[in-house]
Interface confidence: low
């Protein structure tokens, strides 16, 4: 989870589930692996925006202390601010919780830029607008950090939803979702609908606006249109998937598909951008530049350093191409594609200089750690993290930003041969680095 572009990011002892409340009864029969249908209590439970992350309200301790927690599918620790910090309005006060248990162990998590460190413990945790349960989970109490918390983001901690393999300090620290599933009847599945506004939000607008939904334990049909298409989770560490083809406005990038997944491809709600391996990024930008050549943009724009502005309401969406990523399907030699619009990969920013223009940053950037399908991709889709069946589902989000001419799409099936060859096998050295 990288800082700046990657939101700063990089878990429950199987203790007795004190205060356990069973899930609410529903009028539908549960359907494995997760309940499907209406999850009214969880819809609209996220706030935030792609540049600073999406967060859910959680409570920790007894009596409950309410905190806003960043939802991060690119890490596996539940970590919360536990000491005063200039960017935090509130923090977890362990001494006020009668159910806190100290694990007498520290944790240190460095990033390329910045870090956090803290003390491990367990406590009772619940999600007010989530399943009606309380679980005892591992918590990293952050006592010191650098370039981790974001001024004005309104979140005080991070919920790492990936697998134990990438938990810090090691894979013995059970992640929150594992604890939740073990201690309750919540099915081993969650789904995310991240809703980009399509325009910059100021602080009060973010607080007042809806940012999306995290449905824990199921799938809500009201959050997507069309069909859900599933891609296998290649390996349970990050949410790793395999991209088999990339097109810009329908034109194949024609690269060896291994390049698309070098050294991995992950789905990460804690990263802002679509991040692509160097070679892929260069080819993609060349193709996007060619497609949008009716207007000339400064080099700094393509590097994500400089914004471009148009008079309010005049953004020429039509000159920018759509981008399609083909993902390995569940059936042999079958793939499907997800297609995003410039409304997803041009990120609206509040221009420091004027409110008269609509200004954007190019939200595709270069990566040295593989492809990262961050918030700009996820904002186009309803994404189902079906851990029980080791697969990730994509459908067109009911809240994605589009225009009257084009819409995001999830389409298939397509015949694609030798897709297994598209996966990159990382040499077996120490993979537990967060220095990405």
């Amino acid at each position: 989870t990288q800082h700046g572009i990657r939101l700063p990011l990089r878990s429950g002892l199987g203790g007795a589930p004190l205060g356990l409340r069973l899930p609410r009864e529903t009028d539908e029969e549960p359907e494995e692996p997760g309940r499907r249908g209406s999850f009214v209590e969880m819809v609209d439970n996220l706030r935030g925006k792609s540049g600073q992350g999406y967060y859910v309200e959680m409570t920790v301790g007894s009596p409950p202390q309410t905190l806003n927690i960043l939802v991060d599918t690119g890490s596996s620790n539940f970590a919360v601010g536990a000491a005063p910090h200039p960017f935090l309005h509130r923090y977890y006060q362990r001494q006020l919780s009668s159910t806190y248990r100290d694990l007498r162990k520290g944790v240190y998590v460095p990033y390329t830029q910045g870090k956090w460190e803290g003390e491990l413990g367990t406590d009772l945790v619940s999600i007010p607008h989530g399943p009606n349960v309380t679980v005892r989970a591992n918590i990293a109490a952050i006592t010191e950090s650098d370039k981790f918390f974001i001024n004005g983001s309104n979140w005080e901690g991070i919920l790492g939803l990936a697998y134990a393999e990438i938990a810090r300090p090691d894979d013995s620290l059970e992640p929150f979702f594992d604890s939740l599933v073990k201690q309750t009847h919540v099915p081993n599945l969650f789904s995310l609908q991240l809703c980009g506004a399509g325009f910059p939000l100021n602080q009060s607008e973010v607080l007042a606006s809806v940012g999306g939904s995290m449905i824990i334990g199921g799938i809500d049909h009201s959050l997507y249109t069309g069909s859900l298409w599933y891609t296998p989770i290649r390996r349970e560490w990050y949410y790793e998937v395999i991209i088999v083809r990339v097109e810009i406005n329908g034109q194949d990038l024609k690269m060896d598909c291994k390049e698309y997944n070098y050294d991995k491809s992950i789905v990460d709600s804690g990263t802002t951008n679509l991040r692509l391996p160097k070679k892929v990024f260069e080819a993609a930008v060349k193709s996007i530049k060619a497609a949008s050549s009716t207007e000339k943009f400064p080099d700094g724009f393509w590097l994500g350093e400089q914004l471009v502005c148009w008079q309010a309401g005049t953004t020429p969406w039509n000159i920018f191409p759509v981008i399609s990523l083909y993902l390995m399907g569940e059936v042999t030699n079958q793939s499907f594609r997800i297609t995003i619009l410039p409304q997803q990969y041009l990120r609206p920013v509040e221009d420091v200089a004027t409110s008269q223009d609509d200004c954007y940053k190019f939200a595709i950037s270069q990566s040295s750690t593989g492809t990262v399908m961050g918030a700009v991709i996820m904002e186009g889709f309803y994404v189902v993290f079906d851990r029980a069946r080791k697969r990730i589902g994509f459908a067109v989000s009911a809240c994605h930003v589009h225009d009257e001419f084009r819409t995001a799409a999830v389409e298939g099936p397509f015949v694609t041969l030798d897709m297994e060859d598209c996966g990159y096998n990382i040499p077996q050295t120490d993979e537990s680095t967060l220095m990405t």
Epitope: L307, V308, C309, V352, A353, T354
Partner: nanobody, 129 residues
Framework: DVQLQESGGGSVQAGGSLRLSCAAS???????IGWFRQAPGKEREGVAA???????????YYADSVKGRFTISQGNDKNTVYLQMNSLKPEDTAIYYC????????????????????WGQGTQVTVSS
């Protein structure tokens, strides 16, 4: 390439006024124009800046020493920026430079010379008492 050309400098009595112009060419997208000055034996310092955006003049920024006396504005053609200097003082005597930089998201502090990468040749302003 971006080119900047200042004009309008000259000599004036204390309390008088001058209007400097900066003609910019070569920018196709949003950018900042700043006015800086350098008095003999002193470091170059920021005076005022304005964001030039597609729809017209954006936010303006002023050094404390000139607030209320100087006004920066954009001309109708979008390629000219004016610095209207009123209530001039002898300490305003300096060579005045026009400078430009891309308008990027990480924009502060705006009135530091190091933030600007395109510079004009300068125009002399002399204020006598």
């Amino acid at each position: 390439d971006v080119q900047l050309q200042e004009s309008g400098g000259g000599s004036v009595q204390a309390g008088g006024s001058l209007r400097l112009s900066c003609a910019a060419s070569g920018y196709s997208y949003s950018y900042y124009i700043g006015w800086f000055r350098q008095a003999p034996g002193k470091e170059r310092e920021g005076v005022a800046a304005i964001a030039i955006v597609n729809s017209g003049g954006g936010r303006t920024y002023y050094a404390d020493s000139v607030k209320g006396r100087f006004t920066i504005s954009q001309g109708n053609d979008k390629n000219t920026v004016y610095l209207q200097m009123n209530s001039l003082k002898p300490e305003d005597t300096a060579i005045y430079y026009c400078a430009a930089r891309s308008l990027s998201w990480y924009s502060h502090p705006l009135l530091q010379p190091s933030q600007f990468n395109n510079w004009g040749q300068g125009t002399q302003v002399t204020v006598s008492s």
